[in-house]
């Protein structure tokens, strides 16, 4: 595929990445799949600046990110190392709370109303943010 050099229509460029901000809600898995179909992934927050940028665009609304612990340890969807990376959890989070009565714990991370992170039930229909890196090979065939 060809190298993507600018962001698609309706995506926002920031620091060599493109971001798309949903205005509807989906379960985490559906949001993850939506981003993949766009040749992207749920947003991976790797720095203070990226946190601030995303927070600025989503406002005070619960919004999924590309972080989960559905298979045990916390993992970013693009393979970025969780342990050594940027974190912005709310105090006492993540807590894998079982008291919601929906079965199981809380395995998916989202931005809360103040931008800090919380783990929640993955089935909740939250907004989401997709991210794709510029300079990475696109799956689309090159234009002739």
């Amino acid at each position: 595929g060809s190298e993507r050099t600018c962001c698609p229509v309706n995506w926002v460029e920031h620091e060599r990445s493109c971001y798309w901000f949903s205005r509807s809600g989906k379960a985490w898995a559906d949001a993850d799949n939506y981003c993949r179909l766009e040749d992207a992934h749920l947003v991976v927050v790797t720095s203070w600046e990226e946190q601030k940028f995303v927070q600025h665009h989503i406002g005070p609304v619960n919004t999924w990110m590309g972080l989960h612990d559905q298979n045990g340890p916390w993992k970013w969807v693009d393979g970025t190392d969780y342990e050594t990376g940027f974190k912005n959890w709310r105090p006492e989070q993540p807590d894998d709370w079982y008291g919601h009565g929906l079965g199981g714990g809380e395995d998916c991370a989202h931005f809360t109303d103040d931008g800090r992170w919380n783990d929640d039930v993955c089935q909740r229909p939250y907004r989401w943010v997709c991210e794709t890196e510029l300079d990475k090979a696109s799956q689309e065939p090159p234009l002739l």
Epitope: W48, K87, N88, P91
Partner: antibody
């Protein structure tokens, strides 16, 4: 009301070490990030370092990186700044400040003066 | 690092005057700009955060505006208690940086 009280300042020779403390009260210390900010006499403000509420992230100004270490003891409601290899240009009033919204200082201590001089 | 440039560095004004202090960032900081007031021998006090939000207890004569690189702090009717030094500060990116300050003096 929220109170932050710094201590540990004083006169120290260049190359020596000093540890500042900041005792917090009247809020849930373990729920807030904390900063150190300094002000040279008669001059402006310079951010020094920040530590997350749980210690998971720390950031430093380039001017102190590798020499200063920020830490906290949530069980004692206390913030620390270990200052090694002190230089004359580290002379300043050092304030601790509570973090609100990732990088906003909503409450400040009264400051403690550090003088680095031979 | 993001440089914050404040102007003017000092100004003289009278009680009742409307004054404006400007702050310019060397790159976009979105709306992540805070304003502080400092009196001699005292710690700074937060007035405005994220460019235009009032800290609790701050009088309504103080207001902030701007986004991107250009920001302003306005005092609509200067009061005796307002004679102090004012600093802007960006919280978008570490290292967090302050403007050089604006000293507001009595004319």
């Amino acid at each position: 009301q929220v109170q932050l009280v710094e201590s540990g300042g004083g006169v120290v020779q260049p190359g020596r070490s000093l540890r500042l403390s900041c005792a917090a009260s009247a809020f849930t210390f373990s729920s807030y990030g904390m900063h150190w900010v300094r002000q040279t006499p008669g001059k402006g403000l310079e951010w020094v370092a920040v530590i997350w509420h749980d210690g998971s992230n720390k950031y430093y100004a380039d001017s102190v990186k590798g020499r200063f270490t920020i830490s906290r003891d949530n069980s004692k409601n206390t913030l620390y700044l270990q200052m090694n290899s002190l230089r004359a240009e580290d002379t300043a009033v050092y304030y601790c400040a509570r973090d609100e919204q990732l990088g906003t200082f909503d409450y400040w201590g009264q400051g403690t003066l550090v003088t680095v001089s031979s | 690092d993001i440089q914050m440039t404040q102007s003017p560095s000092s100004l003289s004004a009278s009680v009742g005057d409307r004054i404006t202090i400007t702050c310019r960032a060397s790159q976009s900081i979105l709306s992540y700009l805070n304003w502080y007031q400092q009196k001699p021998g005292k710690a700074p006090k937060l007035l405005i955060y994220v460019a235009s939000s009032f800290q609790s207890g701050v009088p309504s004569r103080f207001s902030g505006s701007g986004s991107g690189t250009d920001f302003t702090l306005t005092i609509s009717s200067l009061q005796p208690d307002d004679f102090a030094t004012y600093y802007c500060q960006q919280s978008y990116s570490p290292p967090l940086t302050f403007g050089g300050g604006t000293k507001v003096e009595i004319k």
